[in-house]
């Protein structure tokens, strides 16, 4: 390690002469006053006056001997002022003060860029005393320096609550370039100019930076850091890294690797999760982004019936949660479903289309054109209708539900009858004489009963009346049921 | 504005050294390398190499290694290329470029016809 | 080291007219340069890394390619774009130019 020593600054007596148990023999007193302090002789204490603040890193002690005559100031001796030394290695500095033995409990604190060393830190204090004074001798010692270790030590040493402090030794650690800014990875568009950043210090400084595309070398001159490197665009990904040269050698930052956004690829595993009559909810599995974050999907839809007009059905949804219930379909029908995701770059292509099917549903429709007429001979209701179109049945057919309420003077009863799907008429008994029956036929599949049809109405007369003529429900577009007689 | 100033047309004969220099003005010099470029009469441009003009260190393209020398002088923000034991063959223009990111040559001299006739 | 063959050597163009010089690298790089010269001219930087026109280049100048295989087009020529075209690769050390490629106003 490099040691630089400032010139120790001749002190200059207080008083002519050596005083009685002087450790040294250059005729300079230990307890010396620095230049740098810029004390004055002219300021001392008197016995009588209370302690004020030391100017400088000097105390001028209260107490005085027998005669009366106050002792010189205390201060710390001259040192090392900087010391430059490499990463890992090893330092020790150590402040000394030559003490009056009148003072008891002297210590000495270590300070660092103006906190207090405390801890685990390798500072001793050494005692050598003598007739009148003691000389103190604090070492600080670090096995094995980091950059975290430069920094202004200092010495304080209490008196009498007053302060002593030595002067600076400046702990300057050198070292290979420190990252503090690493060129960072990316996802940019193809040919499209973007910047990179890359900052390292010392000590020592200067640093400078020369930046590795593909292990080329990009400036064949170095930059100072910071640097910033325009890359002018790529189409094909590349890696980046920035080198970090100082006096005490080079350091190589982490390679980033810089891709090139892309149209995604299109998805995989497109699912069927659950299927009914007018829906079915699929799932599938996003591909690869393309370096760039999906923006929405489309479901596209077709009918798988050869017959069908090829006609496409699109559905726009968000890109999570990979989910989608495709609604509004035919029941018991066919369809190809395929699935094509966007980012900012673009769609992807289609992913393989998949076979679905919906299930049977309730008829969408009520059975059409209910006619309804008494049959009075066999006290029957003779009930007729047209079967829904086939296209709205969404099923097969299994039967007819048919709903009769009959009313009469407060009393209302409602009664269902099932009939198999081969009819378009049926035949129920007279419940209550005098009375109003409404009758309601909905059409039933597998996937559960249809919408009832409009309520058709017809007046059950006491018996001996004559024969009325049937009602009917209107064609469609018509009004209300009437009750024909 | 940036700018390189080459020295005028040189006639050798064969055998002799030519000295080609190549100022640069309206940038710090030592920013950028300096680059080296031959064209022969009715040739293309051929790379010669280029000059640290951080460190003064040269690089040569293998063709150019032996006759040819490229220096500094940073005091005046000058470069330079020497050719000794001068041929027929080295009669050419030789241009002065900066070495930018990448091996971009964005700035040029005006070029230097050295002729080498007996 | 990388060889560049541009093509073609020569190309008589009348005015108007869509112009395509090609340069082939005899392996991939990572960028081509384009420099235009004039007779008894220096050379004057035209493309930068392929497809980045220097400045004042016209906009009626493109340049594209990756790999091997990197182009110059002109859309529309015009008189004063009669000139020699070089290209050079950046990516591998020396660096080398193309042979270039003469235009001539027909």
């Known amino acids: 390690a490099i040691t630089e020593a400032r010139e120790e600054a001749k002190p200059y007596p207080l008083f002519p002469g050596p005083f009685p148990g002087s450790l040294q023999t250059d005729h300079t007193p230990l307890l010396s006053l620095p230049h740098a302090s810029g004390y004055q002789p002219a300021l001392m204490f008197s016995p009588t006056q209370p302690g004020r603040p030391h100017t400088g890193n000097v105390a001028i002690p209260q107490v005085t001997s027998v005669e009366s005559k106050p002792l010189p100031p205390l201060a710390f001796k001259h040192t090392v002022g900087h010391i430059i030394l490499s990463e890992h290695k090893g330092v020790k500095f150590n402040c000394s003060i030559s003490v009056p033995n009148i003072y008891q409990d002297t210590t000495i604190s270590w300070w660092k860029d103006g906190k207090e060393l405390l801890g685990a830190h390798h500072a001793i204090t050494q005692f050598y005393p003598d007739d009148e004074v003691t000389a103190i001798i604090a070492s600080f010692s670090i096995t094995s320096v980091q950059r975290s270790d430069n920094g202004s030590y200092i010495c304080k040493m209490k008196i009498n609550n007053e302060e002593i402090v030595s002067d600076p030794i400046y702990i300057e650690v050198q070292g290979l370039p420190h990252f503090t800014k690493q060129p960072e990875s990316m996802n940019v568009t193809r040919n499209t100019a973007f910047n990179l950043t890359c900052q390292a210090v010392g000590p020592p400084e200067p640093v400078n930076i020369f930046w590795v595309q593909n292990s080329s070398r990009v400036n064949e001159q170095p930059e100072k850091s910071p640097s910033v490197l325009t890359v002018p665009g790529l189409t094909e990904m590349a890696v980046f890294s920035c080198e970090a040269h100082n006096d005490k050698g080079l350091t190589v930052s982490k390679g980033v690797q810089i891709n090139i956004k892309a149209i995604p690829s299109p998805p995989t595993e497109v699912s069927i999760r659950n299927s009914t009559a007018h829906s079915i909810l699929i799932s599938w599995v996003p591909g690869f982004d393309g370096y760039s974050p999906f923006r929405n999907c489309s479901i596209q839809v077709k009918e798988a019936d050869p017959l069908s007009n090829g006609s496409v059905m699109i559905f726009n949804t968000s890109a999570l949660p990979h989910l989608y219930q495709i609604k509004q379909l035919q029941a018991l029908a066919n369809y190809s479903i395929g699935v094509s995701c966007m980012n900012e770059i673009g769609w992807s292509a289609v992913s393989p289309w998949i076979l679905a099917s919906t299930t049977e549903g309730a008829p969408s429709v009520a059975p059409l054109n209910v006619t309804v007429f008494l049959n009075e001979s066999s006290d029957n209701v003779d009930i007729r209708w047209m079967k829904p179109p086939t296209k709205q049945q969404d099923g097969e057919l299994v039967g007819y539900r048919i709903s009769h309420v009959w009313q009469s003077a407060g009393i209302s009863k409602e009664l269902l009858e099932e009939v198999g799907q081969n009819g378009s008429r049926a035949r129920i008994s007279v419940q209550v004489h005098n009375a109003t029956c409404t009758v309601r036929i909905a059409a039933v599949t597998r996937g559960g009963v249809g919408p009832f049809s409009d309520p058709v109405k017809i007046f059950i007369p006491a018996h001996g009346w004559v024969d009325y003529a049937p009602s009917s429900t209107p064609a469609p577009g018509n009004a209300d049921p009437v009750l024909i007689i | 504005q940036i700018q390189l100033v080459q020295s005028g047309s040189e006639l050798k004969k064969p055998g002799a050294s030519v000295k080609v220099s190549c100022k640069a003005s309206?940038?710090?010099?030592?920013?950028?390398?300096m680059n080296w470029v031959r064209q022969a009469p009715g040739q293309g441009l051929k790379w010669m190499g280029w000059?640290?003009?951080?460190?003064?260190?040269?690089t040569y393209a293998d063709d150019f290694k032996g006759r040819f020398v490229f220096s500094l002088d940073t005091s005046v923000s000058t470069a330079y290329l020497q050719i000794s034991s001068l041929k027929a063959e080295d009669t050419a223009v030789y241009f002065c470029?900066?070495?930018?990111?990448?091996?971009?040559?964005?700035?040029w001299g005006q070029g230097t016809l050295v002729t080498v006739s007996s | 080291e990388i060889v560049l063959t541009q093509s073609p050597d020569f190309q008589s163009v009348t005015p108007k007219e869509k112009v395509t010089i090609t340069c082939r690298a005899s392996?991939?790089?990572?960028?081509m340069h384009w420099y235009q010269q004039k007779p008894d001219q220096s050379p004057k930087p035209w493309i930068k890394?392929?497809?980045n026109l220097a400045s004042g280049v016209p906009s009626r100048f493109s340049g594209s390619g990756s790999g091997t295989d990197f182009t110059l087009t002109i859309n529309s020529l015009e008189a004063e774009d009669a000139a020699t075209y070089y290209c050079?690769?950046?990516?591998?050390?020396?660096?080398?130019f193309g042979q270039g490629t003469k235009l001539e106003i027909k």
């Open positions: 470029a900066t070495y930018g990111h990448y091996a971009w040559f964005a700035y």
């Open positions: 309206g940038y710090t010099f030592t920013n950028y390398g």
């Open positions: 000059i640290n003009t951080y460190t003064g260190e040269p």
């Open positions: 392996s991939s790089v990572s960028y």
């Open positions: 890394a392929t497809s």
């Open positions: 050079q690769q950046w990516g591998t050390k020396p660096l080398t």
